[in-house]
């Protein structure tokens, strides 16, 4: 009598919803095991916890195998939404950026957060500094006292995505000449001005002197 | 009632293959998974592989080179291959049954087989 | 592989007395852990799994608790025939691995 009544007990709960795709099931714990290629997942309800056949895992749990042992396993990776396997992430946590299956607060060194996927994708890479530049100004590395001297980098790998931005190639910074003076009395463009509005004065005041002259003779004249 | 019995040569020398048999009766070994486990003589449980229902296997990865566990479903027996053992393997073998990840692990057992390895 | 750190190695207990066995896997292994008691000259039988699912026939004096890395098996008032090796499973991982297991004796 009693094992005639569990039995159609058991029957009973292959039409409940949790006895889906199941090959034993209980009122109690639900499946303990799957049929085959679906993923036994235990779901958990406060205290409670009964075993489910699914055909993919949810958000937060990937498919680990085993050979003819399915199952779905937590993502156990910081910060991470979803996974593919144990160690490899798909899906970061809102705030958090996805690189190589894990998850960032920041991207690494030499990569870029690409805001709409939030995924660090490879930033724009630059070679090393060269040597500091001769210091010059106008062109010219002599005739002044403070000059601008510059040095370059090179892109040696274009960023992923037009829109990441390239850090900064070239950068200048003040410095001193190191000859204020040029050799061979070449002046710089400042000191002939200099000379040629002293000469203009000069020739204006002795054109003034000349005509001065001039109108005191003619009057004498007169 | 599930019962599983271990049988084989409970002495092999150095260098030669251990084998062992399990005999199942009161289920089918093409429903669920067939498991060996040994006891080393310091109370050390160490699970070495299983054969499923569908007959794929899985062994330990430090075992895998040496170890395969094989099945005959007309005789429902499965059975244990130890190729080059060493003193190492002197250990009780069982072999032991489960159903799934939301049953019992191992809920059944054989009684346990010493086997020794010395020359 | 898990690492399953068990403790004690072994204890001495009074009849009727409250005892504790814990486990410590070396990673979250998500309650899928079984216990088992092992009896001289006997195979070992098992007596709890999925953390605190006892199997049918075990009496209700065993319990087990836990979740992520630490749990632990109670035996609410000491018996007997409760004296054994217990041991820890977690299957969460293949390779599946054991604890190094409590001897457990009577006092």
């Known amino acids: 009598q009693g094992n005639r009544w569990r039995r159609s007990k058991r029957a009973s709960y292959v039409s409940n919803p949790i006895c889906k795709g199941c090959l034993s099931c209980s009122k109690d714990n639900g499946c303990s095991r799957c049929q085959q290629k679906l993923f036994f997942f235990l779901r958990r309800e406060g205290m409670r916890q009964y075993g489910e056949c699914l055909h993919s895992c949810p958000s937060g749990y990937y498919g680990h195998r085993a050979p003819d042992m399915n199952r779905c396993a937590r993502c156990r990776i910081e910060n991470c939404d979803s996974c593919f396997s144990k160690d490899f992430c798909t899906k970061c946590k809102v705030g958090f950026y996805l690189h190589r299956g894990r998850c960032f607060d920041e991207c690494p060194d030499g990569f870029a957060p690409l805001e709409e996927t939030m995924e660090c994708v490879e930033g724009c890479e630059v070679g090393h500094w060269s040597e500091w530049g001769t210091c010059s100004r106008n062109n010219r590395t002599c005739g002044f006292k403070w000059g601008l001297e510059t040095r370059t980098r090179q892109i040696v790998k274009k960023p992923a995505k037009d829109t990441i931005p390239c850090p900064t190639i070239a950068e200048s910074r003040r410095c001193k000449m190191a000859m204020r003076h040029c050799p061979g009395g070449k002046r710089t463009p400042k000191a002939k001005e200099k000379r040629n509005k002293k000469k203009k004065r000069k020739l204006i005041e002795r054109a003034q002197e000349q005509h001065s002259v001039f109108l005191a003779t003619d009057r004498a004249n007169q | 009632e599930v019962q599983l019995q271990e049988s084989g040569p409970s002495l092999v020398k150095p260098s030669q293959t251990l084998s062992l048999t399990c005999s199942v009766t009161g289920d089918s070994i093409t429903s669920g998974y067939w498991s060996w486990i040994r006891k080393f003589p310091g109370n050390k449980l160490e699970f070495m592989g299983y054969?499923?229902?569908?007959?794929?296997?899985y062994y330990i990865p430090s075992l895998k080179s040496r170890v395969s566990i094989t099945r005959d479903t007309s005789k429902n027996q499965y059975y244990l291959q130890l190729n080059s053992v060493t003193t190492e393997d002197t250990a009780t073998y069982y072999c032991?049954?489960?159903?799934?990840?939301?049953?019992?692990?191992?809920?059944?057992w054989g009684q346990g087989t010493l086997v020794t390895v010395s020359s | 592989d898990i690492k399953m750190t068990q403790s004690p190695s072994s204890m001495y207990a009074s009849l009727g007395e409250r005892v504790t066995i814990t486990c410590k896997a070396s990673q979250d292994i998500d309650s899928y852990l079984s216990w088992f008691q092992q009896k001289p000259g006997k195979s070992p039988k098992t007596l709890i799994y999925?953390?605190?699912r006892l199997i049918d026939g075990v009496p209700s004096r065993f319990s087990g608790s836990g979740s992520g890395q630490d749990y632990s098996l109670t035996i609410n008032s000491l018996e007997y025939e409760d004296m054994g090796i217990y041991y820890c499973l977690q299957y969460d991982e293949f390779p599946v691995t054991f604890g190094a297991g409590t001897r457990l004796e009577i006092k």
């Open positions: 054969i499923s229902f569908s007959g794929k296997t």
């Open positions: 032991a049954t489960y159903h799934g990840y939301g049953g019992p692990w191992f809920a059944y």
């Open positions: 999925l953390t605190n």
